[in-house]
């Protein structure tokens, strides 16, 4: 697109509610969009006690707070649900909690996949 | 133009049945989501019912469930909403959107609305 | 279900008016929340989505903050065209569900 930002294409796609809202439970969304509007990934979680539930992953339209991020980074002290987005393909597979107020940074990884 | 154009609205009896349409131009319409949402006269907006692109998945307020049915044609790039079992409180104007591929999932095309009105 | 709470209601203002709406939702929606401006016997027309980017077209008078469960919809400077009735939407789940409507009225 000739502007030097990543170009996301694919991201990771995750739905907890996927029985309810009967979608598939996880696997990869090709980001379609507007030509004129930029395309993100995106992850959201939940850390309750230290144990980490995943929300919804996927791709994400147009957003000035995603622009130029190589890596998922949630930056909010303490949300009800973590939130972060990024670009560059299947960019939110990992995903990371750096509160801007500083404190540890945390760093959560997808399971490694069974080989077949 | 991206446009979303309903039709179908109008006078129906309580008990009565209705079949609102939706006709997609300028989009890709096989690949996005969309819903009905309704308006009665001097209230807000309700959803009603969703649709995924491929009409794999439908989802409905409880309000409808059980009366209304949400469907598409792909082939004439049409929306539909079958409304049975109406009832006066289902009076409103019934606006078909689009709701945008990747998230947040806005409504960001409306059609101009059709209006049903349930009464004796 | 997600409940949308706006306040006020409706509000009174003057052109030039810097006006301020709230929504609050009863659980987090995280950055799934959009907003809308609905004028009489018109269609919604979406102003902002994903809490804070302005949809195309939409002027720069209009900005959109919070998170979680908290949300603002600002319009810096009321302009005549803006007197409409605004709608906050959460896409977190399903059903969609909205806010009851704030109506800007002139003063």
């Known amino acids: 697109s000739g502007r030097g930002e990543a170009e996301t294409r694919e991201c990771i796609y995750y739905n907890a509610n996927w029985e309810l809202e009967r979608t598939n439970q996880s696997g990869l969304e090709r980001c379609e969009g507007e030509q004129d509007k930029r395309l993100h990934c995106y992850a959201s979680w939940r850390n309750s006690s230290g144990t980490i539930e995943l929300v919804k992953k996927g791709c994400w339209l147009d957003d000035f707070n995603c622009y130029d991020r190589q890596e998922c980074v949630a930056t909010e002290e303490n949300p009800q649900v973590y939130f972060c987005c990024c670009e560059g393909n299947f960019c939110n597979e990992r995903f990371t909690h750096l509160p801007e107020a500083g404190g540890p940074e945390v760093t959560y990884e997808p399971p490694p996949t069974a080989p077949t | 133009e991206v446009q979303l154009l309903e039709s179908g609205g109008g006078l129906v009896q309580p008990g009565g049945s209705l079949r609102l349409s939706c006709a997609a131009s300028?989009?890709?319409?096989?690949?996005?989501?969309m819903s009905w949402v309704r308006q009665a006269p001097g209230k807000g907006l309700e959803w009603v019912s969703a649709i995924s692109g491929s009409g794999g998945s439908r989802y409905y307020a409880d309000s409808v469930k059980g009366r209304f049915t949400i469907s598409r044609d792909n082939s004439k790039n049409t929306l539909y909403l079958q409304m049975n079992s109406l009832r006066a409180e289902d009076t409103a104007v019934y606006y078909c959107a689009r709701e945008q591929g990747p998230g947040p999932y806005a409504f960001d095309i409306w059609g101009q609305g059709t209006l049903v009105t349930v009464s004796s | 279900d997600i409940q949308m709470t706006q306040s006020p209601s409706s509000l009174s203002a003057s052109v030039g008016d810097r006006v301020t709406i709230t929504c609050r939702a009863s659980?987090?929606?995280?950055?799934?929340l959009n907003w809308y401006q609905q004028k009489p016997g018109k269609a919604p027309k979406l102003l902002i989505y994903g809490i804070s980017t302005l949809q195309s077209g939409v002027p720069s008078r209009f900005s959109g903050s919070g998170s979680g469960t908290d949300f603002t919809l600002t319009i810096s400077s009321l302009q005549p065209e803006d007197f409409a009735t605004y709608y906050c939407q959460q896409s977190f789940s399903l059903p969609r569900t909205f806010g009851g409507g704030t109506k800007v009225e002139i003063k």
């Open positions: 300028g989009f890709t319409f096989s690949s996005q989501g």
């Open positions: 659980q987090s929606v995280s950055r799934f």
